[in-house]
């Protein structure tokens, strides 16, 4: 392209050095905070995700700032302020620290922020070939339509009574719960 260091191609205080081979007439050595072949791009220091626990990163040029989510503090939002303090999870759920917000790990059959909503493990229709799904407290249970078997009713039963079970794991029977 014919551009040389004499043309001042390095921006933002970059140091121009003459190229060692004919294909690169110059090389820019960029100062901290800048990148690109001509030091024209500001380095996005937030791309390194320095703010922990979901904090919002702000690059102020001269410094980085983290805006922390509720429940966290510190220059990099690294301090957990115990978001479970005073929080209750219903129906046997347990509060889990982290994530910046009160979070419940719910017992089987319950869901929602505070485990107050009934969760239906059958909603995804896990029982194949028209099998019926039941939300038993021990886990979902499938009752297969006639002609099918397996924990999820995935295997057809042949007319002679044998099934198309490919080397079934021990104890696999119709209706075994999926925990």
């Amino acid at each position: 392209s014919g551009v040389t260091c004499a043309d001042g191609p390095c921006f933002n205080g970059g140091l121009c050095v003459g190229g060692a081979d004919p294909d690169s007439a110059y090389i820019c050595h960029c100062p901290p905070g800048f990148q690109g072949s001509n030091c024209e791009k500001r380095v996005d220091r937030c791309s390194l995700q320095p703010c922990r626990n979901g904090g919002l990163c702000l690059d102020l040029g001269h410094a980085l700032r983290c805006r922390c989510r509720a429940g966290f503090a510190g220059p990099r939002c690294e301090h957990d302020l115990d978001d479970c303090a005073g929080r209750a999870c219903a129906n046997g759920g347990t509060c889990v620290e982290g994530g910046g917000a009160h979070r419940c790990s719910c017992a089987l059959g319950f869901g929602g922020r505070d485990c107050r909503e009934r969760a239906d493990p059958c909603a995804a229709r896990p029982c194949a070939h028209g099998g019926r799904c039941y939300a038993h407290f021990s886990g979902l249970v499938c009752a297969c339509a006639p002609g099918y078997m397996g924990a999820r009713c995935e295997f057809p039963v042949h007319p002679d009574g044998a099934s198309a079970l490919p080397a079934a794991p021990p104890g696999l029977r119709p209706g075994d719960p999926q925990r």
């Epitope: 009934r118 239906d120 059958c122 019926r132 039941y134 939300a135 038993h136 021990s138 119709p174 209706g175």
Partner: antibody
């Protein structure tokens, strides 16, 4: 507290009709259950009548109950049993019961008495 | 599908053992979808055992279920006065069919 309560029982004449209602509290039929009707004649054992699977609304009946009994879901918390051409032999306590898996009834209502007599 | 219970009635002394048998004309679903209930006058049946041998929550451990396929047994070890009741077996069959046994009355003296 999960509960079932039956209503609609009473005295009915032979060949008459009656509709029983099962009302759930503490849970709703948005989850998948068999909501069933079981009857028990005085001094006899329980007898399964019919179920409705709340997952897709499909129904199942004892062979003797087909035609005269109809189970349906009236709302997210109520199930009904319509009975027609009632006979003296249909006199019994009618229970609403829930199957939550493994084919057993883990939750029962207190029952409602149906008396068929002239 | 017919479930036959034997014997009835059955009598036991307090602290004794009661054994009730339940036989099905065909295999229950999954070979073990059979349950046992206790019923007292004026009350609905109360489940004791499900899936042939699983004790329902809150049921005393003196109640034990066993068996598979078509033959099942309920055993009460160390019978109490409060165990005097009628006991029913109930099966679930392929095709979404339910059936109850005829019942066994247990007298505890």
């Amino acid at each position: 507290q999960e509960q079932l309560v039956e209503s609609g029982g009473g005295l009915v004449q032979p060949e008459g009709s009656l509709t029983l209602t099962c009302t759930a509290s503490g849970f709703s039929f948005s989850s998948s259950y068999d909501m069933c009707w079981v009857r028990q004649a005085p001094g006899k054992g329980p007898e399964w009548i019919a179920c409705i699977y709340t997952g897709d609304g499909s129904t199942d009946y004892a062979s003797w109950a087909k035609g005269r009994f109809t189970v349906s879901k009236a709302s997210s918390t109520t199930v009904t049993l319509q009975m027609t051409s009632l006979a003296v032999a249909d006199t019994a306590t009618y229970f609403c019961a829930r199957n939550s898996g493994y084919g057993y009834f883990g939750l029962w209502g207190p029952g409602t008495l149906v008396t068929v007599s002239s | 599908q017919v479930l036959t219970q034997t014997p009835s009635p059955v009598s036991a002394a307090v602290g004794g053992t009661v054994t009730i048998s339940c036989q099905s004309t065909e295999s229950v679903y999954g070979s073990d979808w059979l349950s046992w209930y206790q019923q007292k006058p004026g009350q609905p049946p109360k489940v004791l055992i499900y899936q042939a041998s699983n004790l329902e929550i809150g049921v005393p451990s003196r109640f034990k279920g066993s068996g598979s396929g078509t033959q099942f047994t309920l055993t009460i070890s160390g019978a109490q006065c409060d165990d005097a009741a009628t006991y029913y077996c109930q099966g679930y069959y392929s095709g979404y069919i339910y059936a109850f046994g005829g019942g066994t009355e247990v007298v505890v003296k």
